[in-house]
Interface confidence: low
């Protein structure tokens, strides 16, 4: 039996579900009574899940695995692993026995994004050029171990006196702490970049140190250069910071967040207290951090309509402002594939293959490919409809003349998340087979 699994490791986020794809080609007349399927850990041979004597024998792996019973007869022996943990990382072998026997191993690579680094400064007051300061960058609950890079305001690496430690917690997730000792110039921005090597995700924290009052007398307000990307339904932090002078108290602070284009008030702090949200009660400041110059805004349950630019106005004696962009995103669902006609197909027939993917944002890029990954640029019609929440449903239709056989793949790409959702259909001229669970590949 020829058993097929993906060449590349399956990358799964901690706490999410992962599909370990495995497929075989059932012969005509094949029935599930003939099938023996075993999933086991490659190294230890520990049983994970099995199918025998015509029925699912269930999970032997903490009740977190499942097969796809409706797809087994079509040759889909894939395994669903729920609530992925760091300890699941490794190789899983898929054994298929009908009359003959075949096996193949698929690797699971577990990952967890690192939190946005928190930055602390010691000493934090009365700084003068020439002082030595210790900047600590802390980022939490990532996997695997991070690469930590320090940069100056121009993005050039700071390779000086850096000490980085990484500690794993009980779940195997790492907390990273990196300390930079640096001699201050007239002023400077120090950024700590915590990189997840599997997700290719960079979490960045930065601190701007202005040892003496800015000669213009203006408040220097710092926001991230790049858009903040937030998933629909999650919370986002719009970072904004200023440098409080010695003796600064919150009674002196006026802080206003507003929509840059319409000037609509979002949130404010004045007269020594939080004046609250003026934006559907979905915003909050970080009150404990304001005195240290952290004027960031937390936006809860992000919606598509939130996308755009937010301005952070800070007034103490003087005044400063800066705008931060929020880019909203939502992943596209795994495409469902339909075929018309779906029976009695012969080479030379024209078929219509429809690929549908739902509830993504922003608009997707849709690409059709053949079995070799070459683009199919033929007769393709793609439409995208936004629902009431502004999320897009994508429908792409390919009309194609059949060869002897062929695989047709539809790739729905989210341009912001660099996330690809794959669906495919294999047409063999007589029986038609759908390949195993589509593979979501994340680019970062």
């Amino acid at each position: 039996v020829e058993v097929q699994v993906p060449e590349d490791p399956v990358v799964a986020l901690v706490g999410t579900d992962a599909t370990l794809r495995c497929s075989f080609l059932p012969e005509p007349g094949f029935s599930l009574a003939q099938l023996n399927l075993i999933w086991q850990l490659t190294d230890t041979k520990q049983l994970v899940h099995s199918f025998a004597e015509g029925r699912d024998q269930g999970s032997a792996y903490a009740n977190r695995t499942a097969l796809f019973p409706d797809l087994l007869a079509q040759g889909n022996a894939s395994l669903r692993l729920q609530r992925v943990r760091v300890a699941d990382e490794g190789s899983f072998t898929c054994f298929v026995s009908i009359r003959d026997f075949g096996s193949a191993a698929v690797s699971l690579q577990v990952a967890a994004p690192y939190s946005k680094p928190s930055m602390t400064l010691e000493p934090s007051k009365d700084l003068r050029p020439g002082d030595t300061v210790t900047i600590t960058c802390s980022s939490y609950r990532g996997y695997p171990e991070a690469e930590v890079l320090w940069q100056d305001g121009q993005g050039a690496p700071l390779t000086g006196n850096v000490t980085t430690s990484q500690m794993a917690n009980e779940q195997g997730l790492f907390d990273v702490r990196s300390v930079l000792r640096v001699v201050l110039g007239a002023n400077g921005t120090y950024s700590c970049l915590v990189r997840n090597p599997v997700l290719q995700q960079d979490a960045r924290g930065s601190v701007t140190i202005t040892p003496h009052r800015s000669p213009t007398g203006a408040v220097e307000v710092q926001v991230p250069e790049d858009p903040v990307v937030a998933l629909v339904g999650t919370d986002a932090t719009l970072c904004c910071s200023f440098s409080p002078e010695p003796g600064f108290s919150l009674a002196q602070l006026n802080l206003i967040w507003q929509l840059t284009d319409t000037k609509q008030l979002v949130h404010s702090f004045a007269e020594g207290r939080d004046q609250g949200s003026a934006y559907a009660n979905r915003t909050a400041l970080f009150p404990d951090l304001l005195a240290q110059g952290n004027a960031s805004l937390r936006l809860q349950r992000v919606r598509v309509a939130d996308e755009g630019s937010f301005t952070c106005f800070v007034s103490i004696r003087d005044f400063g402002s800066a705008a931060v962009s929020l880019q909203v995103a939502a992943p596209y669902s795994k495409p469902s594939m339909t075929l018309e006609p779906s029976k009695d197909l012969r080479p030379g027939d024209t078929v219509t293959i429809t690929c549908s993917s739902y509830r993504g944002y922003p608009e997707a890029e849709v690409l059709w490919q053949d079995g070799q990954g070459a683009p199919l640029t033929g007769n393709v019609t793609t439409s995208q409809m936004a629902n009431e929440q502004g999320l897009f449903d994508v429908r792409s239709v390919l009309r194609v003349v059949l060869g002897a056989n062929g695989t047709y793949s539809c790739l729905v790409r989210n341009p912001v998340l660099q996330q690809d959702a794959h669906g495919s259909v294999t047409i063999t001229g007589q029986p038609m087979t759908f390949p195993p669970e589509a593979h979501h590949h994340h680019h970062h």
Epitope: P157, P227, A323, S325, E363, Q418
Partner: antibody, heavy 120, light 107 residues
């Protein structure tokens, strides 16, 4: 599909200014940094500057600071590059290009290029 | 600014050959290295970003490798349509800078 369409060729005298446009379609214009890159005849590629149309934020390379202005019109999804005090060595093909997301400075979509000739 | 040096500046190879182009950065740029292909009279096209990631629609005969300051673009089996000039570009630090280009011709 994602496309950047640039304005047509220009012939200018030394000392004059030129303004090249780049109309974007097929994606969310305000979410991607837009670059301007030029290429003198028979030469390599040279990055001039970039704009984030979402809020108008710009970055310029030192060489062109003070002489180049990049702007964007969100209502028409169009970016503009204006170069002033033209000299003969500004004769080049000028390209707009979209920066890919995530935070990597690679340019995944390019305009077809606009030829600017500076000649007395 | 970071200087990018490509070599060779031109090279001639036969269809089916394995072709390698190198690019060196004047300072460490981690993996922030991209490759473009430009055919005469046309705009550049992105081939590879972040050292080794193939842009969508790019044939798998193209691959990239390297880290830090030294990088390589490889075409595993040269095809007639690969005749073009290839540029590397660093994206580690603003301003982004390009290599001088490598002109690839068929023998």
């Amino acid at each position: 599909q994602v496309q950047l369409v640039q304005s047509g060729a220009e012939v200018k005298k030394p000392g004059a200014s030129v303004k090249v446009s780049c109309k974007a379609s097929g994606y969310t214009f305000t979410s991607y940094w837009m670059q301007w890159v030029r290429q003198a005849p028979g030469q390599g590629l040279e990055w001039m500057g970039t704009i984030y149309p979402g809020d108008g934020d710009t970055r310029y390379t030192q060489k062109f600071k003070g002489r180049v202005t990049i702007t964007a019109d969100k209502s028409t999804s169009t970016a503009y590059m204006e170069l002033s005090s033209l000299r003969s060595e500004d004769t080049a093909v000028y390209y707009c290009a979209r920066r890919g997301i995530p935070r990597l400075w690679y340019f995944d979509v390019w305009g077809q290029g606009t030829t600017v000739t500076v000649s007395s | 600014d970071i200087q990018m040096t490509q070599s060779p500046s031109s090279l001639s190879a036969s269809v089916g050959d394995r072709v390698t182009i190198t690019c060196r950065a004047s300072q460490d740029i981690s993996n922030y290295l991209n490759w473009y292909q430009q055919k005469p009279g046309k705009a550049p096209k992105l081939l590879i970003y972040y050292t080794s990631r193939l842009h969508s629609g790019v044939p798998s005969r193209f691959s990239g490798s390297g880290s830090g300051t030294d990088f390589t673009l490889t075409i595993s089996s040269l095809q007639p349509e690969d005749i073009a000039t290839y540029y590397c570009q660093q994206g580690n630090t603003l301003p982004p800078t390009f290599g001088g280009g490598t002109k690839l011709e068929i023998k």
